[in-house]
Interface confidence: medium
């Protein structure tokens, strides 16, 4: 399969290279935020597959924002093959084995396996179907082969790799991390408030992904969707985590410039290649 040997540029009439991301936020589009500072920051561009500079306004934005080029590369790229996978002579685990389990933001509830660095074992978890990270395996065996130590304390040596011409890195061929934004949408936190079909007027909260806040709405008592919480705290706990909007310590004042709506920078329908 030559699909990883493509050039860096998209060529629309040939096979396109799969994309594997260590962290889901690496796919977010750079967001300068509504403030007006001029701060040089870096983001990972999924199309060029490189960390690039952008000007950050100083507040809000998203997690695809790094103080330095090195930090960005560390979080989002695999240009240093040894960082991700050591040579089989060294028998070391790839870095993503040490990532925490990440169910992502969607609601597929798919059974997957991840390597738990605390217990040093592969364990089952429920994957939502999108986002997440590379510590995500379709089978227990696959997880064990890649991340667990063999009986002699060495990593099992059947971790197939292939040179990826896109960023000159080695990418695991056996990890079938599902499409990053597979058509498993939408996440309930991204759906609009839905009163439902009944006639009650119950006070509820929903997560407004445009402004990144939990807002009250009147629930009819039946139907609707799962973007429906009995308290603001419950709403924030469930939804805010995925869309952190960090205010800078500088305490910048938002100007009266027309505020750019804080839409989620990725559509949860985004449909990617299966083997990301």
């Amino acid at each position: 399969d030559s699909e990883e040997d493509e050039e860096h540029t998209i060529i629309t009439d040939t096979e396109l290279p799969p994309l594997k991301l260590m962290h889901s936020f690496c796919a977010f589009k750079a967001d300068d935020g509504p403030c007006k500072a001029i701060m040089k920051r870096f983001f990972f561009n999924i199309f060029t597959r490189q960390c690039e500079e952008f000007i950050y306004g100083g507040c809000e934005g998203n997690q695809n924002r790094f103080e330095s080029l090195e930090e960005c590369k560390k979080m989002c790229t695999r240009d240093n093959a040894n960082r991700i996978i050591k040579t089989t002579l060294q028998q070391e685990k790839p870095d993503f084995c040490f990532l925490e389990e990440d169910p992502g933001i969607c609601r597929g509830y798919i059974t997957r396996y991840f390597y738990n660095n605390q217990t040093k074992q592969c364990e089952r978890f429920k994957y939502g179907g999108c986002l997440g990270n590379m510590n995500n395996f379709e089978t227990l065996e696959e997880c064990k082969n890649i991340c667990e130590d063999g009986p002699n304390g060495f990593q099992v040596d059947n971790y197939g790799t292939q040179l990826n011409a896109v960023n000159n890195s080695l990418t695991p061929q056996s990890t079938k991390v599902p499409s990053l934004f597979e058509f498993h949408g939408p996440s309930w936190c991204l759906t609009p408030a839905d009163r439902g079909l009944c006639r009650a007027n119950e006070n509820r909260f929903y997560y407004n992904s445009v402004i990144g806040k939990c807002r009250p709405f009147k629930y009819s008592g039946c139907g609707g969707n799962e973007n429906n919480f009995t308290s603001k705290q419950e709403c924030l706990r469930a939804c805010k985590k995925g869309f952190i909007q960090r205010i800078s310590k500088g305490g910048l004042i938002k100007t009266k410039r027309k505020r750019k709506k804080q839409r989620v920078k990725i559509a949860y329908e985004e449909i990617f290649v299966k083997n990301m």
Epitope: E15, F183, L190, I271
Partner: antibody, heavy 118, light 108 residues
């Protein structure tokens, strides 16, 4: 080289049915989600339906919901669009397209014309 | 739902610069793509990810996207650039693809 070839279009009466096919080659079909886009004569492009790489999730534009069904057979490298209860306003060239990063439609077929008329 | 608005037509003299706009609420927070379509043919991708050119697309094609507007710029427009151009983005709803109404570029 990526190739998408649509077939199954033709003339059908209002209320009738048609099944469009899109034969894919030159890429690993089962790795990609796919979509149908249509274009009425002299009009713009309109997204119709989409399906995940393994067929487990399907999406439809409001205008076709309940009447059209998208499906795929990965063993045959083929995408389908079953169109029932056809209306005059469904008359269009139907394109299948492969979906790439961030909903980019990278790779289109040449289209098949569906005419709904009595 | 995000709606994308394009001017129905743009005219430009050969060798001049053509600019086709695509506006939508907070469009700059999404990636924008541009397709060129000539009569009787399927759309062809000319710009992806706001500003990137696929291989085979001439350097005179460029793109930008910020605020509420994405712009396709064709510098030194040539007769063969005469076509319909569509912007596309995605919806933070249930549509994986949202298209602008299309702009007919006429090279005078």
């Amino acid at each position: 080289q990526v190739q998408l070839v649509e077939s199954g279009g033709g003339l059908v009466q209002p209320g009738g049915s048609l099944r469009l096919s899109c034969a894919a080659s030159g890429f690993t079909f089962s790795n990609y989600s796919m979509t149908w886009v249509r274009q009425a004569p002299g009009k713009g492009l309109e997204w119709v339906s989409g399906i995940s790489y393994n067929g487990s999730n399907t999406y439809y534009a409001d205008s076709v919901k309940g009447r059209f069904t998208i499906s795929r057979d990965n063993s045959k490298n083929t995408l389908y669009l079953q169109m029932n209860s056809l209306r005059a306003e469904d008359t269009a060239v139907y394109y299948c397209a492969r979906i790439y990063y961030m909903n980019l439609l990278a790779g289109w077929g040449q289209g098949t014309l569906v005419t709904v008329s009595s | 739902d995000i709606e994308l608005t394009q001017p129905p037509s743009v005219s430009v003299a050969p060798g001049q610069t053509a600019r086709i706009s695509c506006s939508g609420d907070a469009l700059g927070t999404y990636y924008a793509y541009w397709y060129q379509q000539k009569p009787g043919q399927a759309p062809v991708l000319v710009i992806y990810g706001d500003m990137n050119r696929p291989s085979g697309i001439p350097e005179r094609f460029s793109g930008s996207n910020s605020g509420n507007t994405a712009t396709l710029t064709i510098s030194g427009t040539q007769a063969e650039d005469e076509a319909d151009y569509y912007c596309q983005s995605y919806d933070a709803g249930v549509k994986p693809a949202v298209f602008g109404g299309g702009t007919k570029l006429t090279v005078l």
